[in-house]
Every structure is written in structure tokens, then in C-alpha cells.
């Protein structure tokens, strides 16, 4: 049965989703556990500059000591404003001067990267010692590079497209994910439903998505259920300001008892049948509909508590 | 449609073994979380365990009663599920169903009977 | 464990009756779902999540209920309605299955 919801852009007013993801349009992990110094390169796309980027590497201690020193190559189409955080990292920075500007005074070795295409680079930076991570992101808002963490099975790092970089590298988009909405055909009264998909990764293994839902309406105002559809290795930790119907894939459980693991159900895994579960659920507004890549992190702030709905 | 045929069940003696089987078909076995649920005579039922798919790394859960005792496995290319049952007990003595969770156990084999007795 | 208590554990009532089945739980859950079983036969999927009756189930059976209190009713017994029925919560690990209620002919 055709459930009729035209499904239209939802002003940013209405409700916005911003994630982090370790998806990648290009990437590779490799491991290199003997080098001297571990290389991690960035390929960084704009669309349009100047642009700011929040970068922060993140060392995990071994055998009770930092690791071993890093070189980050970072290659950037347009004018970046980087904050960088890298606290106690011994860290060698290689960039383009005149496209990045650094808000405060970075701290750290730094080295001239010539003007080179990609796979030049790629060999560049290899010839510096053995490749750790690649990647390659299209405006990134912020990045999280996480040290001594490569779990990779190459012992090469060869940029292969649409890759998980798994929790070498997160990082988020800059534009938030698109949010549509519509009215359920049909179904009176005044409940809301926010439904989220996440496509399939490129990587398999068990994922914890926690998703941040934030609702700003008067606790007794809301009747909403919150549709969390996903591949069966995903399971989710919800942290919502409001407490609303839940209506899960895999498992779930709240950020205030994470230990209390909640069955969910086979849901469909199409937009149409999503709209159907919805209804089923007798909502009569679907407030926002988001697909997402794989992703760690899901934030979505809505103001429509059951509220007239309005498109862009 | 949706079949689920248990086999493997018969008299054993106190502390031997017994391997079930549950043949699936009718729907895609490979992306489905099996379960266990077994019935003792004249009594309710109880859950015994589950296996996850490929997926979620075959990841198997168990009841506190059967832990240690018993395993869950699953063999996709055949689309079986088994339950190899080890140090049985009196008490272990009961109809064995094999189950498929959607919304709920929504699919469920005839069941097969384990009889532990000296 | 989260104990699910039911009551009656068996009652009689006639055709035509209306019939209601608690279930409580030692502890909060999201959902109650619900099974039917007749004698020799395996239990069928009756009522998930609390309320939504499974493919084929009659409408005179509704299920509600929130937090630890969850109900099954049938509005108007019918014969084909004699049977045990559970109550089954996934809300926490383990799964814990209610103790059944008979509901035989007066």
C-alpha cells in the first residue's frame, strides 16, 4: 500500500541533523607498526573559501608512553583557517603556507608541501616513512585524527574509493544533512515522527550510532516517535531531551542506563516503508526524514512539537 | 512463506550431549537474529538463547540456566541453525523451538522434544 | 532480570465474555508483546509492541499499557480464543517470558 507523504525540504528553522562519520570518498588505514614515524595524509577539498577547519589529533599511550613521532601531510584546494589541536604530540605538520593560516601559533614543526597532484604527494609522503591513513574529505567542518589507532589489514596504504576509516579518522561535514518532512495523508491529531536512516558502511563490524535528538517544545506538548532505521550491525545510544516512542533497528539504549540494551524490530529499509511504519504509528506529521552515511554521531535539533509543518 | 523445522531431539541420559537443528526457508536466514525458546512440560516458555548475523560478528547470547553448557551456531550456506547442548541436565528436559525475531518472535518452528532421564 | 508476573494465571469465562490479561513487570519496559499457544502447538505471534496485532489476529484482541503495566483484552470471546497466552519483554537481557494465563471455557 502507497503511503502518500510528499516528502519536501524542511526549513533549517524547523530542524537541522549535523553527524560525524568515518566514511570517506577516497581513504586507506594501513599498519605500520615498526616505522619510526607514522604518516597520516589528508586530502582536503572546498568548495568554496576561505574556509575554517577544527583539526584535532588525538595520541592513545602505549606501553604507558606517547608514540612514536607523526607527520601529518595536509593538501588543500582554497584558503583553510586551521585550529589545530594536537597537545603533546610530536607532531610534524607538512601544508601549503599560502592556503592555510593557522588562528593561533601551532607549536609544531612545520615543512613547505610542494605543489604536487595527489599521487605525487601520496609519494612524497612515503618517501618519509610508510603511510599510516589517507583520506580524502569534502568540506570538512571538523576532523578527529586518532593516533596509534590504525586497524587496518594492508600493510599499504593505497586510496581505494568510498572507504571506512573505522576510529583512525571522524570527522563532520560542514553542511548539514538534508531534512525533508511531510503530512501523513489521513491520520488526524497532532503526533510527530522523526525518522533517521543509515545507509550501509563500507565496513561491516558492529557500530554504536548515538543519536542527540533535541526538541524544543514544552515536555507535555510532545507526542513524537523517533524511527531509527539502520543495517543489522548498528545498534544506538539515544540521548533525547524529551521522552518519546521509540521504534528501532537492532538495539537501543539511553544515555542514562547505557547498560540496558532494548530490543528493536526488522524495519523496512525504504523510504516508502519508513513513511509506513510511521503511519502505522499513527503519526500524522512526519516532522523530519534524514539518510545519512554511517555515521558515529547524529545531532537533530527540531522545533515542531506536533506543530504545523513548513517547508522551504 | 516463513519455515522453520527443528530436528535432533530424543531421550538422553543425564550429562550427555545433544546437537538440535533448525532448517529455515522462506526468507533471507543469512541477515536474521535466531533464537532459542524452549517449553517444559506442563510449563511456560523460557528463552534460551541467540545468535546474531554475520554482520553483528555471529554474536551469541545465552541464558544464565544453559551458559557453559550450551552453544548456538549457525551455518548461513546451509541456512541452519543448531543448539549443541552438553552436561544436560534433568531440568533440561523440554520442547526446543527455534525462533526468528521481526517485530517480535513472529516466526516459530513445531518444536522438538529433549527428554533427559536415566 | 526483569520478572513479568501474570494474572490470572488461569480463569473461565464464557463465548461472548470480555476478557482482560495483566501482565506486570518487576521493572520498566518500552514494550509488551504477546503470544497465544494451544495445546501440542507452538506459540504464534499474537500482539507486538504493546498494541499492533500480528498478521491475522481478530480484531476483538487490543493490547495497551505502559511502564510495568501492560493488559491483553479480548472484547467478545470467541471459541477459537480458548488457549494459554504470554506476555514477553525485550527491554532488558535477558528476554523474560510471563508465566501464561489459561483461559478455558465456563
Known amino acids: 500500500e502507497t503511503v502518500h507523504c510528499d516528502l519536501q525540504p524542511v526549513g533549517p528553522e524547523r530542524g537541522e541533523v549535523t553527524y560525524t562519520t568515518s566514511q570517506v570518498s577516497k581513504g586507506c588505514v594501513a599498519q605500520a607498526p615498526n616505522a619510526i614515524l607514522e604518516v597520516h595524509v589528508l586530502f582536503l577539498e572546498f568548495p568554496t573559501g576561505p574556509s575554517q577547519l577544527e583539526l584535532t589529533l588525538q595520541a592513545s599511550k602505549q606501553n604507558g608512553t606517547w608514540p612514536r613521532e607523526v607527520l601529518l601531510v595536509l593538501s588543500v584546494n582554497s584558503s583553510v583557517f586551521l585550529h589545530l589541536q594536537a597537545l603533546g604530540i610530536p607532531l610534524h605538520l607538512a601544508y601549503n603556507s599560502s592556503l592555510v593560516t593557522f588562528q593561533e601559533p601551532p607549536g609544531v614543526n612545520t615543512t613547505e608541501l610542494p605543489s604536487f597532484p595527489k599521487t605525487q604527494i601520496l609519494e612524497w609522503a612515503a618517501e618519509r616513512g610508510p603511510i599510516t591513513s589517507a583520506a580524502e574529505l569534502n568540506d570538512p567542518q571538523s576532523i578527529l585524527l586518532r593516533l596509534g589507532q590504525a586497524q587496518g589489514s594492508l600493510s599499504f596504504c593505497m586510496l581505494e574509493a568510498s572507504q571506512d576509516m573505522g576510529r583512525t579518522l571522524e570527522w563532520r561535514p560542514r553542511t548539514p544533512a538534508l531534512v525533508r518532512g511531510c503530512h501523513l495523508e489521513g491520520v488526524a491529531g497532532h503526533k510527530e515522527a522523526h525518522i533517521l536512516r543509515v545507509l550501509p558502511g563500507h565496513s561491516a563490524g558492529p557500530r554504536t550510532v548515538t543519536v542527540k535528538v533535541e526538541l524544543s517544545c514544552a515536555p507535555g506538548d510532545l507526542d513524537a516517535v523517533l524511527i531509527l532505521q539502520g543495517p543489522p550491525y548498528v545498534s544506538w545510544l539515544i540521548d533525547a531531551n524529551h521522552n518519546m516512542q521509540i521504534w528501532t533497528t537492532g538495539e537501543y539504549s539511553f544515555k542514562i542506563f547505557p547498560e540496558k540494551n532494548i530490543r528493536g524490530f526488522k524495519l523496512p529499509d525504504t523510504p516508502q516503508g519508513l513513511l509506513g511504519e510511521a503511519r502505522m504509528l499513527n503519526a500524522s506529521i512526519v516532522a523530519s526524514f534524514v539518510e545519512l552515511p554511517l555515521a558515529s554521531i547524529v545531532s537533530l535539533h527540531a522545533s515542531s512539537c506536533g506543530g504545523r509543518l513548513q517547508t522551504s | 512463506e516463513v519455515q522453520l523445522v527443528e530436528s535432533g531431539g530424543g531421550l538422553v541420559k543425564p550429562g550427555g550431549s545433544l546437537r538440535l537443528s533448525c532448517a529455515a526457508s522462506?526468507?533471507?536466514?543469512?541477515?536474521?537474529?535466531m533464537d532459542w525458546v524452549r517449553q517444559a512440560p506442563g510449563k511456560g516458555l523460557e528463552w534460551v538463547g541467540e545468535?546474531?548475523?554475520?554482520?553483528?560478528?555471529?554474536?551469541?547470547y545465552y541464558a544464565e540456566s544453559v551458559k557453559g553448557r550450551f552453544t548456538i551456531s549457525r551455518d548461513d550456506s546451509k541456512n541452519t541453525l543448531y543448539l549443541q547442548m552438553n552436561s544436560l541436565k534433568t531440568e533440561d528436559t523440554a520442547v526446543y523451538y527455534c525462533?526468528?525475531?521481526?517485530?517480535?518472535?513472529?516466526?516459530w518452528g513445531q518444536g522438538t522434544l529433549v527428554t533427559v532421564s536415566s | 532480570d526483569i520478572q513479568l508476573t501474570q494474572s490470572p494465571s488461569s480463569l473461565s469465562a464464557s463465548v461472548g465474555d470480555r476478557v482482560t490479561i495483566t501482565c506486570r513487570a518487576s521493572?520498566?519496559?518500552?514494550?509488551m508483546h504477546w503470544y497465544q499457544q494451544k495445546p501440542g502447538k507452538a506459540p504464534k505471534p499474537w500482539i507486538y509492541?504493546?498494541?499492533n496485532l500480528a498478521s491475522g489476529v481478530p480484531s476483538r484482541f487490543s493490547g495497551s499499557g505502559s511502564g510495568t503495566d501492560y493488559t491483553l483484552t479480548i472484547s467478545s470471546l470467541q471459541p477459537e480464543d480458548f488457549a494459554t497466552y504470554y506476555c514477553?519483554?525485550?527491554?532488558?537481557?535477558?528476554?523474560?517470558f510471563g508465566g501464561g494465563t489459561k483461559v478455558e471455557i465456563k
Open positions: 522462506g526468507f533471507t536466514f543469512s541477515d536474521a537474529w
Open positions: 521493572s520498566s519496559v518500552s514494550y
Open positions: 525462533t526468528t525475531w521481526r517485530r517480535f518472535f513472529d516466526s
Open positions: 509492541a504493546t498494541s
Open positions: 514477553q519483554q525485550w527491554s532488558s537481557n535477558p528476554l523474560t
Open positions: 545468535i546474531r548475523s554475520k554482520a553483528s560478528n555471529h554474536a551469541t
